[in-house]
Interface confidence: low
């Protein structure tokens, strides 16, 4: 891939990280353990397709079948969860499409998130029959080990009965679990005997114990939570963005670049320019100018807004995004029409972008 002559020095990273950036999530495919999952690689004109999972090259095995543009996973398990990618290799370029697979029933420790059946777990006792706590629905407690992708919601349940009605408290790693122990706290739904943690992070890993007690006794049950963080990867740019645009002289236009990156991304908007009347340097490489980059003085770096455009603004605009692992870039073309010619449908220009890697 080519390197470029730059009008401005693009090698300097900002002193401080970008103050604001959006994260665009790839498509998520959800399957329950034991189910089969089929995903089609959404890339066109693929001569050769290769697959990865969390950065590891994925080959066929007794549960994974790769047929043409399809990936099939038979009898999915939580270990199949992760960030997948298919790369289409063509004669002139390659393109990658990313998607998430989430194989887990951990979100509800045995039921759906809405607790539609939760009232059944709240067992009222005849006031004459004094009884120590007991589990009312052990099926919902059988799965003790929960491996959950970061950012998911986790719910642990301990449906119980007793008379008088027992109280429930939660321990983390054997110690009282307090709201201040995690960012965002947690929810306890006593009538559903549940603990809910939203947007889990690696520090949430550990053993969670429900203690259910009344004056006649105490019972407890422990769940183990493992928060699986995705392996890092180079930035991913949403396909089709930035999109080609057209406007009249004096008009305004906006280019948008949607970025997905686990690591902090650095966004640059770059344009081909002329220097001393030439578009190319003595080495034959094009001159490029950095129009905008993420940094403390930059508003939303994913959007490049051009106001009162002139014919000189026409051309190719490149959104280049890098993190410490690698970089990605996509480009779009701006067509500037004379004022008397009102813009119609966006002008379709197909061109292979100059990759900056």
């Amino acid at each position: 891939r080519p390197s470029f002559s730059l009008v401005e020095d693009t090698t300097l990273e900002p002193e401080e990280p970008p103050t604001k950036y959006q994260i665009s999530q790839p498509e998520v495919y959800v399957a329950a353990p034991g189910e089969s999952l089929e995903v089609r690689c959404l890339l066109k004109d693929a001569a050769v397709i290769s697959w990865t999972k969390d950065g590891v090259h994925l080959g066929p095995n007794n549960r994974t079948v790769l047929i043409g543009e399809y990936l099939q996973i038979k009898g999915a398990t939580p270990r199949d969860s992760g960030l997948y990618a298919c790369t289409a290799s063509r004669t002139v370029d390659s393109e990658t499409w990313y998607f998430m697979v989430n194989v887990t029933d951990a979100i509800s420790s045995g039921d759906d998130e809405d607790d539609t059946d939760g009232a059944e777990d709240f067992v009222s006792e005849n006031s004459n029959n004094k009884r120590a706590p007991y589990w009312t629905n052990t099926e919902k407690m059988e799965k003790r080990l929960h491996a959950v992708p970061a950012a998911n919601t986790v719910k642990f349940r301990c449906p119980a009965g007793g008379n008088p009605m027992p109280t429930m408290r939660w321990l983390k790693n054997g110690k009282e679990f307090k709201q201040e122990h995690r960012i965002g706290g947690y929810k306890v739904r006593n009538q559903h005997w549940s603990l809910i943690m939203e947007s889990v992070v690696p520090s949430d890993k550990g053993n969670y114990t429900c203690v259910v007690e009344n004056e006649y006794g105490s019972i407890n049950h422990t769940y183990h939570l493992d928060v699986v963080e995705r392996s890092p990867h180079r930035p991913i740019l949403q396909a089709g963005l930035p999109a080609n645009a057209s406007t009249v002289v004096g008009g305004d236009v906006e280019f948008v670049c949607k970025v997905y990156s686990d690591a902090q991304p650095h966004i640059q908007w770059i344009k081909h320019v002329e220097k001393n009347g030439s578009k190319y340097g003595p080495d034959g490489l094009p001159y490029l100018k950095v129009l905008k980059h993420s940094g403390i003085n930059s508003s939303n770096a994913e959007v490049l807004a051009l106001f009162n455009v002139t014919e000189a603004d026409a051309g190719e605009y490149i959104c280049k995004v890098s993190n410490y692992i690698g970089q990605a870039n996509q480009s779009a073309w701006l067509t500037v029409l004379p004022k008397q010619q009102a813009p119609g449908r966006e002008k379709e220009i197909t061109a292979s972008p100059d990759y900056l890697e």
Partner: antibody, heavy 120, light 107 residues
Framework: QVQLVQSGAEVKKPGASVKVSCKAS????????IHWVRQAPGQGLEWMGY????????NYNEKFKNRVTLTVDTSISTAYMELSRLRSDDTAVYYC?????????????WGQGTLVTVSS | DIQMTQSPSSLSASVGDRVTITCSAS??????LNWYQQKPGKTIKLLIY???TLQSGVPSRFSGSGSGTDYTLTISSLQPEDFATYYC?????????FGQGTKLEIK
């Protein structure tokens, strides 16, 4: 230049634990993974697992999953491998290796190895 | 796990010889194969990654080839410093696995 310097040889009794260190220098510690590989006397190489120092993401060989713990101290660019419930067949030279990612899982620099002897 | 089988397990050759070591995988590993060199008292050295890419600083007499399940490391003209043990390693699937090694000795 890139260097991985490991801690010295250890002699342990069966059932005990051992913790081997691997100090990295000559590169940015958080930009590469650290893998651990062992080699029993007269035997081949066996991959144990890796840790990503940036986010402490680990991945273990199932064979060792319940006994090995990989950690890092990024402030001193050091990775650690702790193996518990040692058995005599854990006698081996333990290597740390720098893993390049995501271009491919190859180990481009290795430590000198730490001999762990498990004997009663 | 993917099994990697190297052959031969040991090999005697002379300086100047052309030597070939093969590595066979129990399933297709899509060229995701590396080669390493181990000498007594020295750190293990990466020679070739992704089947045929020569690691920086490795002499051009080393080359790699193969596809599917069968891969080869070739040393075109043996030098005295090449006598060592060589290992292949697959990175097609976890856990990463190595061949049992090929010991190259002086004839």
């Amino acid at each position: 230049q890139v260097q991985l310097v490991q801690s010295g040889a250890e002699v342990k009794k069966p059932g005990a634990s051992v913790k081997v260190s691997c100090k990295a220098s000559g590169y940015t510690f958080t930009r590469y993974w650290i893998h651990w590989v062992r080699q029993a006397p007269g035997q081949g190489l066996e991959w144990m697992g890796y840790i990503n120092p940036r986010n402490v993401y680990t991945n273990y060989n199932e064979k060792f999953k319940n006994r090995v713990t990989l950690t890092v101290d990024t402030s001193i660019s050091t990775a650690y491998m702790e193996l518990s419930r040692l058995r005599s067949d854990d006698t081996a030279v333990y290597y740390c290796a720098r893993g390049d990612w995501p271009e491919g899982y190859y180990f481009d620099f290795w430590g000198q190895g730490t001999l762990v002897t498990v004997s009663s | 796990d993917i099994q990697m089988t190297q052959s031969p397990s040991s090999l005697s050759a002379s300086v100047g010889d052309r030597v070939t070591i093969t590595c066979s995988a129990s399933q297709d590993i899509n060229n995701y194969l590396n080669w390493y060199q181990q000498k007594p008292g020295k750190t293990i050295k990466l020679l070739i990654y992704y089947t045929s890419t020569l690691q920086s600083g490795v002499p051009s007499r080393f080359s790699g080839s193969g596809s599917g399940t069968d891969y080869t490391l070739t040393i075109s003209s043996l030098q005295p410093e090449d006598f060592a043990t060589y290992y292949c390693q697959q990175f097609s699937d976890l856990p990463f696995t190595f061949g049992q090694g090929t010991k190259l000795e002086i004839k």
